[in-house]
Amino acid sequence: PGPPPGPPRVSPDPRAELDSTVLLTRSLLADTRQLAAQLRDKFPADGDHNLDSLPTLAMSAGALGALQLPGVLTRLRADLLSYLRHVQWLRRAGGSSLKTLEPELGTLQARLDRLLRRLQLLMSRLALPQPPPDPPAPPLAPPSSAWGGIRAALAILGGLHLTLDWAVRGLLLLKTRL
């Protein structure tokens, strides 16, 4: 009747998976902080910078206590997908001014992509319901000027930094509940 079944496949410890996700997130957080500082030095610009197409911050630090694992990972994945899309757009349409940051933006995009794959893996390891495929997002309009591209870059990096900071706190808190 065929070979005897092998030993059941042991899923890796979800806490270990969560640990490596935290490490990746923290690393990306520092990358983003350093890249934003570099951008501000190259193109000094006063005030806060906003971009309507960016996701709103998922959660205030004070509300972290009420978080549940599926919700956090689903929301984090959705937000990071949006930031990945924005970084890709920035590299493609940001204009010649941002070309000086090309190696760093490329590295940021690759690490963001890696973190998203890690989140996907974590969700399957934890047997969480997989989110439906993302609906096609409307294309982002190119910046109206070189300065518009710089302001967009500052907004994207600022928002990504806040999101990753929230993510680290949330993931560490969730780890204690596993």
Partner: antibody, heavy 120, light 108 residues
Framework: EVQLVESGGGLVQPGGSLRLSCAAS????????MHWVRQAPGKGLEWVAY????????YYADTVKGRFTISRDNAKNSLYLQMNSLRAEDTAVYYC?????????????WGQGTLVTVSS | EIVLTQSPATLSLSPGERATLSCSVS???????LHWYQQKPGQAPRLLIY???NRASGIPARFSGSGSGTDFTLTISSLEPEDFAVYYC?????????FGQGTKLEIK
């Protein structure tokens, strides 16, 4: 050879002010972020402040926020720390330090330090 | 803030012995953001090991670093008289940048 030389330390009364300087040589000063780190007598190291090469991003330790101001003059290859509302607990040797590579925020090279004593 | 705890506080060894210094971090940190410094009495600190395991310029091969996550180690394979000093670990992943309280390596 990278050289960092601090100056401006001394005795000051609580509530007083002092301005520390750090003269840099042996590297392209305008390409590197700089830190101030302090060490109270017989104690460990405490990071105080960081400034990026172009001065557009600055971070402070909570213990000095609102009282200390880090600044730099790239034309003069100089780093500064303006210290106001000084307290006894600010007594320490103050070191300036250069990061390892641009924007990596490390502490690769250190000056010899300047002693600040806050006492009445 | 991320807290670094070094152990032991004091380590008494003889020249030629192996020294193992530990640095425990309150949160998980990526290994590229953990560094070690050496400080001798009356002198400024100097960078010893950066990014967990890379020796800084001019640092002898007897110094090595290892670790990941929350547990990091500085090892001196065979102590020389000039190695007796205070050693600090430091994290650079998060602001505020923080140091451990130091391990004093003294002659037995």
């Amino acid at each position: 050879e990278v050289q960092l030389v601090e100056s401006g330390g001394g005795l000051v009364q609580p509530g007083g002010s002092l301005r520390l300087s750090c003269a840099a040589s042996g590297f392209t000063f305008s390409s590197f972020g700089m830190h101030w780190v302090r060490q109270a007598p017989g104690k460990g190291l405490e990071w105080v402040a960081y400034i990026t090469p172009g001065s557009n991003t600055i971070y402070y330790a909570d213990t000095v926020k609102g009282r200390f101001t880090i600044s730099r003059d790239n034309a003069k290859n100089s780093l500064y720390l303006q210290m106001n509302s000084l307290r006894a607990e600010d007594t320490a040797v103050y070191y300036c330090a250069r990061e390892y590579s641009s924007y990596d925020e490390g502490f690769a090279y250190w000056g010899q330090g300047t002693l600040v004593t806050v006492s009445s | 803030e991320i807290v670094l705890t070094q152990s032991p506080a004091t380590l008494s060894l003889s020249p030629g012995e192996r020294a193992t210094l530990s640095c425990s971090v309150s949160d998980l940190i990526p290994s590229q953001y953990l560094h070690w410094y050496q400080q001798k009495p009356g002198q400024a600190p100097r960078l010893l090991i950066y990014r967990t395991s890379n020796r800084a310029s001019g640092i002898p091969a007897r110094f090595s670093g290892s670790g990941s996550g929350t547990d990091f180690t500085l090892t001196i394979s065979s102590l020389e008289p000039e190695d007796f000093a205070v050693y600090y670990c430091q994290q650079g992943v998060d602001v505020p940048f923080t140091f451990g309280q130091g391990t004093k390596l003294e002659i037995k």
